[in-house]
Amino acid sequence: FERTRSLQDPCSNCPAGTFCDNNRNQICSPCPPNSFSSAGGQRTCDICRQCKGVFRTRKECSSTSNAECDCTPGFHCLGAGCSMCEQDCKQGQELTKKGCKDCCFGTFNDQKRGICRPWTNCSLDGKSVLVNGTKERDVVCGPSPADLSPGASSVTPPAPAREPGHSPQ
């Protein structure tokens, strides 16, 4: 079958990194600069992706493979193949259309991306707040109040954080 196909279609003999040039009697011509073909038998080469501005080059384009981009520091990749770059924020913030904004009281974000999430409600699990939540950290739940009967040893909570707060009860 392969022999038959190559007799019928001379383009099938053109390897990756070349294209079947109709203007030159279907000769296999190398891809021009800034273009590539990742499979054989192609009649055109694809233009290389340009990584500029918010994007930076992770892997250069070659005659057989496209360039790969990531994001300039201060931004992070979104989408398949890093199709978009999105702004980083600080911990304790979330990204909005107005830029990075502090998490509202009762919520936290411990990453440079993503949204602020509500503090854990310790009482739902029958537990008490051992360490207060902050904009950057969730509350730490401790033993249930019943476990802290008189005489039982309890953990001394650390000093309050910058913006102390209890889980919404």
């Epitope: 931004f75 979104l78 989408g79 770059c85 999105e86 990204l95 909005t96 259309k97």
Partner: nanobody, 123 residues
């Protein structure tokens, strides 16, 4: 081919003004949120301002509020950044960038940006 090309950068004294332009080709600017971002020497990329499709929403990073104005000339398929009361800390390469599909709803990702134009504020 979808492209953005910035222009208008240069050397300006502290307190001076500049107007940056960004010309879009290969797509209709009025269909997208548009942004300006900048990169100061040796620093990471910083978001500066954005504007929605019809220009009714405009937002700025705190450090430029009251000094910079983002605008769009949809008829010319162009984006602008008017910069006044410039400071040394505004020295950077400025890029215009397009908000990707779903910007402001699912994400705040930028999918196309230009090569940048350099602004130097120095006496």
């Amino acid at each position: 081919q979808v492209q953005l090309q910035e222009s208008g950068g240069g050397l300006v004294q502290p307190g001076g003004s500049l107007r940056l332009s960004c010309a879009a080709t290969g797509f209709t600017l009025s269909n997208y949120w548009m942004n300006w971002v900048r990169q100061a020497p040796g620093k990471g990329l910083e978001w500066v301002a954005n504007i929605n499709q019809d220009g009714s929403e405009r937002y700025y990073v705190d450090s430029v509020k009251g000094r910079f104005t983002i605008s769009r000339g949809n008829a010319k398929n162009s984006l602008y950044l008017q910069m006044s009361s410039l400071r040394a800390e505004d020295t950077a390469v400025y890029f215009c960038a397009r908000g990707g599909e779903g910007y402001g709803v699912d994400h705040y990702g930028l999918d196309v940006s230009g090569q940048g134009t350099t602004v130097t504020v120095s006496s």
